[in-house]
Interface confidence: low
């Protein structure tokens, strides 16, 4: 349905508040270094323009595309060249190349200061003083640090952020009320950002077909009672929503997401019995709830898959007639029967099935050729099952911190060229799979663990892509989306790595470590552990454990000392010497 003015159409659909918020998110995700005030000014100018178009859709420039309007506005920023360098060259291009150029310059790891949370009283004063600006700053700071954050979902986070301040700034103990809520929002926000980053990587690096396959598998697990045609419709609509958001088309994305939620709720009887509560909520909560809804129960007495996909003499005929539809049906049927499998495993099985049909349907006796195709699935299923079993046992034995350390050592030995902060961040997140998933019963462990690991490894891939340093990482990240985790699992010690020169400065610590939070102190120790492995990649677990135990004792001792700084200086030298001797450095 063509509209005379796209900007007027979206303004009317979304309302002024959401329109302004989404334009701010879009601009902050593109120009991540621009000051807050500059963005607010740009957003206000766009909003005023949109209002003129609502009043008269035939007014000058109202017929222009959103990319043209927004791109023109971004290109008015005076300091574009000095702040962003070659990104300014985007402004010399025409649409759609200009928008593609802006997208390519999004930075997953922008050089921005760490957000430090003020005192609760200070935040509450700021909130009461100017609620609108306070909430805009939240959107701005999250969006510029997470340039692929799912924009309609960020509106939901902002709504919860506002609710937390509204409630807690009136509470008797403001801090006790507010801080846990902010911690929860921060952790959920990081997880949401990482999940969306994987969706965008899937679309941008592997194409729409890869994303659709993921969506078929996931929605079929979630809605096993829905028929294939219904799942296909949802997949098509969901793909459009995420393509738009990942492409910077945030107004269209939010609008289409709302339409999809509306459709799902109007047709919940043919989709899932679990949607009732979600569909009674307001829009932002409704969309979030649908996205997180638990899997519906599997229909009773589903027939064996073999009949249609192996035993039938029409397999090759059906495949040849419409390959992707037939493979989509296979994936749908397999996924709805297996909520206990990870999506990536289901996709590996579908890929194996596709490869077998490609080969066998050209053979002299196709049926004999593909008759045993399901046997090929067994090792693919067993591999993640065994891996999860082993790692959950290790997690239960070690606890989260030491499990993270084991992964830090493992991954530093696999890819020692990767920067230490990235190795620490990624390994810490990999280690969280233990507390997140190992508590689940067997039937829920694999979808929890392997799909979470896909999200974390994608973080490694996007960070590494910015500054590629390891061919092994590039290979694992680019060859196959669904085989990234098996690829990294299969990597062993990098025998080609030349150990890093020993630098005592890396292992010099100061009294400031004593005032850090437990989490920050862990990160300091884990950073030292990675550096140790980079210096001595052949160090044994026992050697590393001994050095780390000595290090922990050293920190504890000096933090209790009267003259902490002297203790760190003197004991630190002894520790470095002892560690060098222990590791043969």
């Amino acid at each position: 349905d063509a509209h005379k003015s796209e900007v007027a159409h979206r303004f009317k659909d979304l309302g002024e508040e959401n329109f302004k918020a989404l334009v701010l998110i879009a601009f902050a995700q593109y120009l991540q270094q621009c000051p807050f005030e500059d963005h607010v000014k740009l957003v206000n100018e766009v909003t005023e323009f949109a209002k003129t178009c609502v009043a008269d859709e035939s007014a000058e420039n109202c017929d222009k595309s959103l990319h043209t309007l927004f791109g023109d506005k971004l290109c008015t920023v005076a300091t574009l060249r000095e702040t962003y360098g070659e990104m300014a060259d985007c402004c010399a291009k025409q649409e759609p190349e200009r928008n593609e150029c802006f997208l390519q310059h999004k930075d997953d790891n922008p050089n921005l200061p760490r957000l430090v949370r003020p005192e609760v009283d200070v935040m509450c004063t700021a909130f009461h003083d100017n609620e609108e600006t306070f909430l805009k700053k939240y959107l701005y700071e999250i969006a510029r640090r997470h340039p692929y954050f799912y924009a309609p979902e960020l509106l939901f986070f902002a709504k919860r952020y506002k609710a937390a301040f509204t409630e807690c700034c009136q509470a008797a103990d403001k801090a006790a009320c507010l801080l846990p809520k902010l911690d929860e929002l921060r952790d959920e926000g990081k997880a949401s950002s990482a999940k969306q980053r994987l969706k965008c990587a899937s679309l941008q690096k592997f194409g729409e077909r890869a994303f659709k396959a993921w969506a078929v598998a996931r929605l079929s697990q979630r809605f096993p009672k829905a028929e294939f045609a219904e799942v296909s419709k949802l997949v098509t609509d969901l793909t459009k929503v995420h393509t738009e958001c990942c492409h910077g088309d945030l107004l269209e994305c939010a609008d289409d997401r709302a339409d999809l939620a509306k459709y799902i709720c109007e047709n919940q009887d043919s989709i899932s019995s679990k949607l009732k509560e979600c569909c009674e909520k307001p829009l932002l909560e409704k969309s979030h709830c649908i996205a997180e809804v638990e899997n519906d129960e599997m229909p009773a007495d589903l027939p064996s898959l073999a009949a249609d996909f192996v035993e039938s003499k029409d397999v090759c005929k059906n495949y040849a007639e419409a390959k992707d539809v037939f493979l989509g049906m296979f994936l749908y049927e397999y996924a709805r029967r297996h909520p206990d499998y990870s999506v990536v495993l289901l996709l590996r099985l579908a890929k194996t099935y596709e490869t077998t049909l490609e080969k066998c349907c050209a053979a002299a006796d196709p049926h004999e050729c593909y008759a045993k195709v399901f046997d090929e699935f067994k090792p693919l299923v067993e591999e993640p099952q065994n891996l999860i079993k082993q790692n959950c046992e290790l997690f239960e034995q070690l606890g989260e911190y030491k499990f993270q350390n084991a992964l830090l050592v493992r991954y530093t030995k696999k890819v020692p060229q990767v920067s230490t902060p990235t190795l620490v961040e990624v390994s810490r997140n990999l280690g969280k799979v233990g507390s997140k998933c190992c508590k689940h019963p067997e039937a829920k462990r694999m979808p929890c663990a392997e799909d979470y690991l896909s999200v974390v490894l994608n973080q490694l891939c996007v960070l590494h892509e910015k500054t590629p340093v390891s061919d092994r990482v590039t290979k694992c990240c680019t060859e196959s989306l669904v085989n990234r985790r098996p690829c990294f699992s299969a990597l062993e010690v990098d025998e080609t790595y030349v150990p890093k020169e020993f630098n005592a400065e890396t292992f010099t610590f100061h009294a400031d470590i004593c005032t850090l939070s437990e989490k920050e102190r862990q990160i300091k120790k884990q950073t030292a552990l990675v550096e140790l492995v980079k210096h001595k990649p052949k160090a044994t677990k026992e050697q590393l454990k001994a050095v780390m135990d000595d290090f922990a004792a050293f920190v504890e001792k000096c933090c209790k000392a009267d003259d902490k700084e002297t203790c760190f200086a003197e004991e630190g030298k002894k520790l470095v010497a002892a560690s060098q001797a222990a590791l043969g450095l």
Partner: nanobody, 124 residues
């Protein structure tokens, strides 16, 4: 490029044993996953066994589990396939293959380098 040369094939009676070797040259052997595949006359090439770079992981086709053992010696740039309790259906041309990485060990298209093959005949 990696060159692979298999040896050790021959004729053996059912229930007998053979040890195949595959010598590699031209690459850093310890960075490759190594696999054995086989192709019987008139049949498709099939996976037999594979071993990870530092022998931490080994994988076997169900048809050979418990009878065949894959091993490697990185100092000698050689991978081995010890075949015990041989059966007539094990008769085939056995190929050694190398891969810098395989998404799954059983798929032949994941392997980058192949030997010429060594013939194993199990017959009374």
């Amino acid at each position: 490029d990696v060159q692979l040369v298999e040896s050790g094939g021959g004729v053996v009676q059912p229930g007998g044993s053979l040890r195949l070797s595959c010598a590699a040259s031209g690459g850093t052997f310890s960075t490759y996953v190594m696999g054995w595949f086989r192709q019987a006359p008139g049949k498709e090439r099939e996976f037999v066994a594979a071993i990870s770079q530092n022998s931490i992981h080994t994988y076997y086709a169900d048809s050979v589990k418990g009878r065949f053992t894959i091993s490697r010696d990185n100092s000698k740039n050689t991978v081995y396939l010890q075949m015990n309790s041989l059966r007539p259906e094990d008769t085939a041309l056995y190929y050694c293959a190398a891969s810098r990485f395989t998404s799954w060990y059983t798929a032949d298209y994941e392997y980058d380098y192949w030997g010429q093959g060594t013939l194993v005949t199990v017959s009374s």
